[in-house]
Interface confidence: low
Amino acid sequence: CDLPETHSLDNRRTLMLLAQMSRISPSSCLMDRHDFGFPQEEFDGNQFQKAPAISVLHELIQQIFNLFTTKDSSAAWDEDLLDKFCTELYQQLNDLEACVMQEERVGETPLMNADSILAVKKYFRRITLYLTEKKYSPCAWEVVRAEIMRSLSLSTNLQERLRRKE
């Protein structure tokens, strides 16, 4: 499946919007920093296959979308930027889901993929638990925003490597 040429550009736009969403200086939230255990090995392995990579990317974007379309998220961010950010994510989900479906149809998604998807789900469970424990404070959201920027950046790198493989 070929992702649209605009897809990498969409990713960069998503990252730019997420950067603009910052409301407080990260340096004022140093005490709230947390290691969420991003499953980096699922995104930077040189041996990855294209089909599982796409479905893991889809899971990552889906989880980010779920996280930022909650009422707690709505209260935390500028509404224009949040709307644009979530709409960008949504478009990416459209692109990726079409690919996931195509790969499934031609039987290219091996079972080993399930572990990678589970790792992403657990990562977001840790993020949600952290926000709950911190009572969705502004600093907690800032820490999560920075973390999502990092994970989105890594996923963008993976998508660009996928494109070079085509």
Epitope: Q62, S74, E79, D80, L82, D83, C86, T87, Y90
Partner: antibody, heavy 123, light 105 residues
């Protein structure tokens, strides 16, 4: 209780213009993206347009792009649909609809609807 | 654009029957699907959202299932008030199915 009260429909000649309004109450209007949905006589439902909470993001079904404009006035809790260059196939009952979920222009279904207003385009 | 194919277009049933309506998407829509009930001269009413979640106040005889491209709405035991037209709607690009009219046999 959520209420969406519509006005502005009527009989109009092809090429004419109409402006539909939808006055919202019973919920925090500015927190929700809003949509318009239409239903031609005896036919099914067709989504027409969506507008984000602030009004900065809009989208339309292809058949009305360039002719219809959706807008909102958050200070008066009102949604609008400006319809220009009306055609016979625009004849329908138009509904404004509130999504179940707040935030983005991707609603998890419409949980509240206006009473509908008939737009009839005929010469 | 994503097309939604809903079938059957008409369904004849009796009170107490269990009925199933199917909606098929032309491409995967995850679980982003809603079901509505509409009676003549009235606005649609949300029954199910996110594929399988029951809207507040909707009787438990209504249930939704499916994800990806195939979805079903089941009415467990048809009541007189359930004779109406039912629509599915995907909210990736917001299109509706053509509708299924459930009528008295």
């Amino acid at each position: 209780d959520v209420q969406l009260l519509q006005s502005g429909g009527g009989l109009i000649q092809p090429g004419g213009s109409l402006r539909l309004s939808c006055a919202a109450s019973g919920f925090t209007f500015k927190d929700y993206a809003m949509s318009w949905v239409r239903q031609a006589p005896g036919k099914g439902l067709e989504w027409v347009s969506v507008i984000s909470r602030s009004g900065n993001i809009v989208d339309y079904v292809d058949s009305v792009k360039g002719r219809f404009t959706v807008s909102r006035d958050n200070s008066n809790n009102t949604l609008f649909l400006q319809m220009d260059g009306l055609r016979a196939d625009d004849t329908a009952i138009y509904y404004c609809a509130k999504p179940k979920d707040m935030i983005v222009v991707v609603p998890a279904g419409f949980d509240s609807w206006g009473q509908g207003t008939l737009v009839s385009v005929s010469s | 654009d994503i097309q939604m194919t809903q079938f059957p277009s008409t369904l004849s049933a009796s009170v107490g029957d269990s009925v199933t309506i199917t909606c098929r998407a032309s491409q995967s829509i995850s679980a982003w699907l809603a079901w509505y009930q509409q009676k003549p001269g009235k606005a649609p009413k949300l029954l199910i959202y996110k594929g399988s979640r029951l809207e507040n106040g909707v009787p438990s005889r209504f249930s939704g299932s499916g994800s990806g491209t195939e979805f079903t709405l089941t009415i467990g035991s048809l009541q007189p008030d359930d004779f109406a037209t039912y629509y599915c709607q995907q909210y990736k690009t917001w299109t509706f199915g053509q509708g299924t009219k459930v009528e008295i046999k």
